[in-house]
């Protein structure tokens, strides 16, 4: 998924169904948020780069008992080639920065949207 939907090739290619569903789930979370997401839980910020799916999962998996992001956690696990468990961290984490889950989800969504617009919006 480093190519992310095929933008390395000429002309834009829409995302796979799985990635489309992940984006839609992130949209649902950000748009339907009423009370503080996951009771305002904090997670490690990540570098939104090539291995971001695993890094995102490693960060979010440390949030337990939050049904609002369970589907996102499951979806991210489908994009990560290795098994991720709580307390596991990669070099992609910005270990000195913690942010609220709501902000984490919003940042991830914005980054995915930017990636898909690359190569078509000049």
């Amino acid at each position: 998924l480093t190519c992310l939907g095929g933008f390395a090739s000429p002309g834009p290619v829409p995302p796979s169904t799985a990635l489309r569903e992940l984006i839609e789930e992130l949209v649902n979370i950000t748009q339907n948020q009423k009370a503080p997401l996951c009771n305002g839980s904090m997670v490690w910020s990540i570098n939104l780069t090539a291995g971001m799916y695993c890094a995102a999962l490693e960060s979010l998996i440390n949030v337990s008992g939050c049904s609002a992001i369970e589907k996102t956690q499951r979806m991210l696990s489908g994009f990560c080639p290795h098994k991720v468990s709580a307390g596991q961290f990669s070099s992609l984490h910005v270990r000195d920065t913690k942010i609220e889950v709501a902000q984490f989800v919003k940042d991830l969504l914005l980054h995915l949207k930017k990636l898909f617009r690359e190569g078509q919006f000049n």
Epitope: G11, P12, P14, P15, R20, L110, F116, R117, F121, N122
Partner: antibody, heavy 119, light 107 residues
């Protein structure tokens, strides 16, 4: 509720330019692309192009490249479409519409702006 | 550029009848196909997205099917307010393109 409100009808002479506005409300403006679609009298719908309000990045239909410019003003949540060197066959209703990402559907539309090009 | 061909151009039916509208893409667009309804003097209205996904507020009599290059919009039982023009739209790649439309008129 989501609303896209467009500017009023315009009558222009051939060779002139027109600038149509589209004011968005009821959602976070930078979260959605704004696309422009036109419809000549009695004809079908034609996609003109799009703008990402967050970055100002644009994508234009080749047919209109060089004649069209799409811009946004995020402070007022307004999108603009300027079409230059107008011809009689540019007479049409111009619609703005929003899309979350280009492959999504156009879920909300403006009411349309009739642009008449006549000498 | 992906070309969408809608057929028939005009469909003459009576209220209560079933309407079947076709949209054919010039290349594989998976399920990135959306349907809109347009009534005279009005902006188009989204009916179906991703070929078969329904929209809240749209009556259940509207349904979509298909994938790849062949798509269908079905209106199970026509109501008087359904007589309008229907357009399909390619959401697969730029330039976004729309079919020429199918006019559903009262017989």
């Amino acid at each position: 509720q989501v609303q896209l409100v467009q500017s009023g009808a315009e009558v222009k002479k051939p060779g002139a330019s027109v600038k149509v506005s589209c004011k968005a409300s009821g959602y976070t403006f930078i979260d959605y692309e704004i696309h422009w679609v036109r419809q000549a009298p009695g004809q079908g719908l034609e996609w003109m192009g799009a703008i990402d309000p967050e970055t100002g990045g644009t994508a234009y239909n080749q047919k209109f490249k060089g004649r069209v410019t799409m811009t946004t003003d995020t402070s007022t949540s307004t999108a603009y479409m300027e079409l230059r060197s107008l011809r009689s066959d540019d007479t049409a209703v111009y619609y703005c519409t929003r899309i979350l990402l280009y492959y999504y559907p156009m879920d909300y539309w403006g009411q349309g702006t009739l642009v008449t090009v006549s000498s | 550029e992906i070309v969408l061909t809608q057929s028939p151009a005009t469909l003459s039916l009576s209220p209560g009848e079933r309407a079947t509208l076709s949209c054919r893409a010039s290349q594989n667009i998976s399920d990135y196909l959306h349907w809109y309804q347009q009534k005279p003097g009005q902006a188009p209205r989204l009916l179906i997205y991703y070929a078969s996904q329904s929209i809240s507020g749209i009556p259940a009599r509207f349904s979509g099917s298909g994938s790849g290059t062949d798509f269908t919009l079905t209106i199970s039982s026509l109501e008087p307010e359904d007589f309008a023009v229907y357009y399909c739209q390619n959401g697969h790649s730029f330039p976004l393109t729309l079919g020429g439309g199918t006019k559903v008129e009262i017989k």
